[in-house]
Amino acid sequence: FSGDGRAVWSKNPNFTPVNESQLFLYDTFPKNFFWGVGTGALQVEGSWKKDGKGPSIWDHFVHTHLKNVSSTNGSSDSYIFLEKDLSALDFIGVSFYQFSISWPRLFPDGIVTVANAKGLQYYNTLLDSLVLRNIEPIVTLYHWDLPLALQEKYGGWKNDTIIDIFNDYATYCFQTFGDRVKYWITIHNPYLVAWHGYGTGMHAPGEKGNLAAVYTVGHNLIKAHSKVWHNYNTHFRPHQKGWLSITLGSHWIEPNRSENTMDILKCQQSMVSVLGWFASPIHGDGDYPEGMKKKLLSILPLFSEAEKNEVRGTADFFAFSFGPNNFKPLNTMAKMGQNVSLNLREALNWIKLEYNNPQILIAENGWFTDSHVKTEDTTAIYMMKNFLSQVLQAIRLDEIRVFGYTAWSLLDGFEWQDAYTIRRGLFYVDFNSKQKERKPKSSAHYYKQIIRENGFSLKEATPDVQGQFPCDFSWGVTESVLKPESVASSPQFSDPYLYVWNATGNRLLHRVEGVRLKTRPAQCTDFVNIKKQLEMLARMKVTHYRFALDWASVLPTGNLSAVNRQALRYYRCVVSEGLKLGISAMVTLYYPTHAHLGLPEPLLHAGGWLNPSTVEAFQAYAGLCFQELGDLVKLWITINEPNRLSDIYNRSGNDTYGAAHNLLVAHALAWRLYDRQFRPSQRGAVSLSLHADWAEPANPYADSHWRAAERFLQFEIAWFAEPLFKTGDYPAAMREYIASKHRRGLSSSALPRLTEAERRLLKGTVDFCALNHFTTRFVMHEQLAGSRYDSDRDIQFLQDITRLSSPTRLAVIPWGVRKLLRWVRRNYGDMDIYITASGIDDQALEDDRLRKYYLEKYLQEVLKAYLIDKVRIKGYYAFKLAEEKSKPRFGFFTSDFKAKSSIQFYNKMISSSGFPSENSSSRCSQTQKNTECTVCLFLVQKKPL
């Protein structure tokens, strides 16, 4: 007997995945993996007193203990609608169907005499139909529905008389059905039978408080199972050649602190007191776990040596149940002060270590949804995906011998103490309907797909391509607002006098009279901050640097009456010094953040972007910047992420849309000004950058989610792109959606009406498309009331825990960027596109492997868009140069300017212009890469500061 389970908790507690394969395995299950689905007789059969069926303890318990439930009759009526169940099984394509026989349907008072004919006919028909369809039956003899007569006459499982009666019942089933059944389960989850039936009273027969009874029941269940196993082994296995086990259920638990021995011992104790209670005698050494014997002393019945030998090894495989029933209610669980967890992979590892690597059938797995959820059970898909991913990793990575999986349950039905308040089926059943149609839920479609593919195939990805970006591709890095230094930090060359130090021994400087030195003019390198920026940029080896000006520093009053020349000089220095390194600037005029709107104080106090005067002020500010810096700057962004800024004005949807309107007009006016006044001489390009995450339907089987994903893109990107890139007006889809909500009284929001003049003003005011892309969001439709932008969209987001994601929960989904680029081209035509910010937060301060993985995978998808989809992608700007203190770590440099290892990785990307094949050399010489700014360099050298 092994008993090594405790080692499971010694894994590295600080492990955070840095690539997808460490978190989710795209792979198949073993050939001939056994895929199935399960039900319990009491839960789905209905007809609780029809055709001679006797009452069970649960039929009685429902009437006496459960509020608002009259009987189990309202369930899915499988007894009547057998054909519908068979069609449902056909739909999914399972290899097996696990169901239970209702003991009182065969023998109404529990004693084996002549079987109830109608009951016998039902199970015979079911078995024959399964065999005909090539679906293997896995039959459970006891799934909690003890004949009431046995409870009333003997006290149920408290009385060891039941052991022989159960064995008689099992013998009948082996004799009658064994020719068609190769897999038998004696008892489903005996822990719950004992613990909730006799401890908490939450299950039938509803007795509670008597711990001795709990462990007596457990003892009798083990002995009953053992007796049946020996019976099958001796009398039936030789000719029926089947397998028999008992389904044991458990939770999983994680230590509060993985290095605290006592926490780990408590976790072990927790598992042993639930799963070990039954598994230790049956799969272990024939006896209860040591810890239980020590703790429970006289309460726990003893096994004699003969009984230990009798019980030990009485299972042909380990049948394991992992579902909500073992996690409810939390206050009755054996948590030992530790943390309950749904980590099925770890639970399987524990079983492997504790019970010597048995063959495992997952005999029940799944979660639940609320009763109001019909066929769109999106969370159920993700729970299933997560569980199946863990099973696959257990098989492939941990070498655990799982040979089959039972999704629970086939149908919605009666859920024990929860009655009809939750649903666990892959098929939706309206319990109030006459015909009880089985409607496949999204989870049924998903499971069907898993079975068809025998696992998880990587559908989303086109294989990686080898190739390079064009030679004039902008390899950039983005920084947010650069705060200008108000005073040059090195004024030592502006004083014309000569000094001697310590001439009289007083350690002071003495001016030498009559000597005047030539001072040198102020230089850009006087700004210490700029030196830091340049050092970092030089190490990045980028061709472009995107940074933002601080509007409030340049124009403290918000108008041209007080221009901060020192600030402008500082920015000019940043650009000119960069050009000396061959780095061109992409300058953002206005870069608001959620914490700080970045507006000059007077404009902020006047209402910010809700006040049209801010629009005029912005135009004037833009003109000043074009005039002062435009000879050196050839790429301009007017406003960074106006589609996010407007969120700040979220008191109402109308505020949001009003602010957005003013931002659009401000941008358009700035663009028109540049076009008219500056483009002829400066020959630059102007745009605005939009936050542009991609959206996928959280539930690909739900039309409403596909519509929600497109709606997200309309509300997020098209809201600004449509007026500027295309029509001069807001997207029709967005306008109509808000209007329809308005009409139905669900929102008082309305998009502003644009005049013909405004439409003409807005339309076409972009020279390129600038997108900030970080992640892909999984969206679902949810009707939301209220008059805010967020509720107008009727969208909720779902976090897929099986996806690699960053500390701030940004999912790493590389293919999203390619889909975005294709969507933009399809909607707005063939234009130059720059990804003006793209990056991930990574906790690592030195070896930021998540960032490297992100860069590699996202750039690979951008390259596919360029090479395969022919998208005119002109540049990629990684976000961001340096991180800010106590903010998410997006930087290539730490807040104290220490370089991270992703810098070398990005350098290599830049020097090879992408992903060249091994034998191809870099096609681009350094001069070609920076063709854009030979003129700029000339100007830098000639123009005084």
């Epitope: 007997f1 092994s2 008993g3 090594d4 405790r6 080692a7 908790w9 010694s10 230590p255 509060n256 602190r257 993985s258 290095e259 605290n260 021995t261 006592m262 926490d263 780990i264 011992l265 040591e290």
Partner: antibody
Framework: EVQLVQSGAEVKKPGASVKVSCKAS????????INWVRQAPGQRLEWMGY????????EYNAKFKGRVTITSDTSASTAYMELSSLRSEDTAVYYC???????????WGQGTTVTVSS | DIQMTQSPSSLSASVGDRVTITCRAS??????LAWFQQKPGKTNKLLIY???TLQSGVPSRFSGSGSGTDFTLTISSLQPEDFATYYC?????????FGGGTKVEIK
């Protein structure tokens, strides 16, 4: 470098108490436990008890219960073991050792000799 | 308490020899046994835990095996720095207990 540095040798009279300290460095003190083990001349090693610094979980060997007290001062990254009602058979080298989750000791102190003699 | 019996209590060997030390528990301790090395003037050094897991930084000539009640520490090719006393410790249940030690001396 992860290390545990213990206080110096002590000579005590029977009936007195001794308090041995163990200063940790090179790792996050609160993430691990400290065990105390002693080795009397010619005797085998004997585990006395354990403290998990993060939440002050303490477990004592029943043999020493009532006589041994294990404490810690997180601000000083130091664990202490106090043994009272000393007798001559308590003469031993006392070790502190960092405890890992599975109950093994991966870093040991250099040992503190305690002599109990009248 | 679980009694740990180590054998032999001492042995003489030469550099390059294969050395085996055994440790027996009075009842099953699963695989939760650690081995460590004690040398005068040095701090004790963990070699193996959980029966067979080599502690990081420990040379691969050290290996552990066994489970239940019988365990073995093997040094595949004895090196000059390996002459020391070796102890086993069960870390299966409180109180943790130790073997009596095996002194490995130069032949």
């Amino acid at each position: 470098e992860v290390q545990l540095v213990q206080s110096g040798a002590e000579v005590k009279k029977p009936g007195a108490s001794v308090k041995v300290s163990c200063k940790a460095s090179g790792y996050t003190f609160t993430n691990y436990g400290i065990n105390w083990v002693r080795q009397a001349p010619g005797q085998r090693l004997e585990w006395m008890g354990y403290i998990y610094i993060g939440n002050v979980d303490i477990e004592y060997n029943a043999k020493f219960k009532g006589r041994v007290t294990i404490t810690s001062d997180t601000s000083a990254s130091t664990a202490y073991m106090e043994l009272s009602s000393l007798r001559s058979e308590d003469t031993a080298v006392y070790y502190c050792a960092r405890g890992r989750g599975l109950g093994h000791f991966d870093v040991w102190g250099q040992g503190t000799t305690v002599t109990v003699s009248s | 308490d679980i009694q740990m019996t180590q054998s032999p209590s001492s042995l003489s060997a030469s550099v390059g020899d294969r050395v085996t030390i055994t440790c027996r528990a009075s009842k099953s301790i699963s695989k939760f046994l650690a081995w460590f090395q004690q040398k005068p003037g040095k701090t004790n050094k963990l070699l193996i835990y959980s029966g067979s897991t080599l502690q990081s930084g420990v040379p691969s000539r050290f290996s552990g095996s066994g489970s239940g009640t019988d365990f073995t520490l093997t040094i595949s090719s004895l090196q000059p720095e390996d002459f020391a006393t070796y102890y086993c410790q069960q870390h299966n249940e409180y109180p943790w207990t130790f073997g009596g030690g095996t002194k490995v001396e130069i032949k």
